[in-house]
């Protein structure tokens, strides 16, 4: 078996792997350096992709910030008149300052009133929401916080105890339901796990996934 594999390595195109029925086959297959199952994406490529994604995200954030600035500018330009100071004397400029101060005071008062109304509305909404929950006999909605969580932990949190017995997400994702192959290799188990274990990938994989 090993000979066949090494022959294939000397040819320009690698031959397909032999049908694997015994665990010894897998061991030999795994220990052959030329036939070692490589990760589809190298670590440097992963890093490159991560960096690219971060760059794109950064650009998006900058674009959004720029859009917000532009929106603010547009809003201000519709609300604030340009200062037309040309030809105005010192007297008019002083008067204008008084006018603008008065306008600022007025806007401040309006802002204070609006904030008070908003606060009142928020309180009313909270009270009404609470009443709705009370009427439905439901618990009070907790305040949500943003948390870092893995997919497994999320499933655990969502499904509780059932998650352990019913759902191993990654196992589900990796399972290939081909009846013939399953019958043939029933005694073998998951050959990928064997390869990972033998090549020392298991530990690294766990680290990466966590």
């Amino acid at each position: 078996m090993a000979d066949g594999s090494s022959d294939a390595a000397r040819e320009p195109r690698p031959a397909p792997a032999p049908i694997r029925r015994r665990s010894s086959n897998y061991r030999a297959y795994a220990t052959e350096p030329h036939a070692k199952k490589k990760s589809k994406i190298s670590a440097s490529r992963k890093l490159q992709l991560k960096t690219l994604l971060l760059q794109i995200a950064k650009q998006e954030l900058e674009r959004e910030a720029e859009e917000r600035r532009g929106e603010k500018g547009r809003a201000l330009s519709t609300r604030c008149q340009p200062l037309e100071l040309a030809g105005l004397g010192f007297a008019e400029l002083q008067d204008l300052c008084r006018q603008l101060h008065a306008r600022v005071d007025k806007v401040d008062e309006e802002r204070y009133d609006i904030e008070a109304k908003v606060t009142k509305n928020i309180t009313e909404i909270a009270d009404l929401t609470q009443k709705i929950f009370d009427l439905r006999g439901k618990f009070k909605r907790p305040t949500l916080r943003r948390v870092r969580i893995s997919a497994d932990a999320m499933m655990q949190a969502l499904l509780g105890a059932r998650a352990k017995e019913s759902l191993d997400l990654r196992a589900h994702l990796k399972q290939v339901k081909k009846e013939d192959t399953e019958k043939e290799n029933r005694e073998v188990g998951d050959w990928r796990k064997n390869i990972d274990a033998l090549s020392g990938m298991e530990g690294r994989k766990k680290k990466f996934e966590s």
Epitope: E84, A86, G87, L88, G89, A91, D95, L96
Partner: antibody
Amino acid sequence: EVKLEESGGGLVKPGGTLKLSCAASGFTFSSYAMSWVRQTPEKRLDWVATISSGGSYIFYPDSVKGRFTISRDNARNTLYLQMNSLRSEDTAMYYCARHHNPDKSGFAYWGQGTLVTVS
Amino acid sequence: DIVMTQSPSSLAMSVGQKVTMSCKSSQSLLNSSNQKNYLAWYQQKPGQSPKLLVYFASTRESGVPDRFIGSGSGTDFTLTISSVQAEDLADYFCQQHYSTPLTFGAGTKLELK
């Protein structure tokens, strides 16, 4: 040559209305603040109103506030003074005046005036 | 409001004489930030509209003969005509441009003897 020409004056009854115009030429009208100044029969000069170059800022003395409205049409190079609720003390020669350059002061140019008689 | 008081109300002078007229304001017209006094002098000849002679109390407007000299600071100002000419026969008004409402003095009438 800077030229300011007032029109629209005349005889009006107390409580009446009148609209004065001032046609400007010889300078970039939209770059200067403009004012109306009146001169009573006793030769006393009274400032009536001022408007900024773009028309956003307006200034009046208390004596005319709420009764007179200054405005401008920069496309037509024209300054206006709408006078409502006229009183006998509003009788005067009404001049339109251009303010000096920003780094200077005072009314640099005056029109020939238009006479308003409230009687 | 700033009150502007001019004196004398009229004066008669002969050609070639030196003329001095006064203008007092009820409060200072000096802007401490730029050290400028916001006072202007106007000349109004009979049947004509006013003409700017001096601004910032002492700066002569372009085209105004150098015999017209503005001076003073704060609340006391003076317009001097060093050598009166026949064409100087007119009313002279001072005006403060320091604060609104803008106010004028009652004027000084210059007559020739």
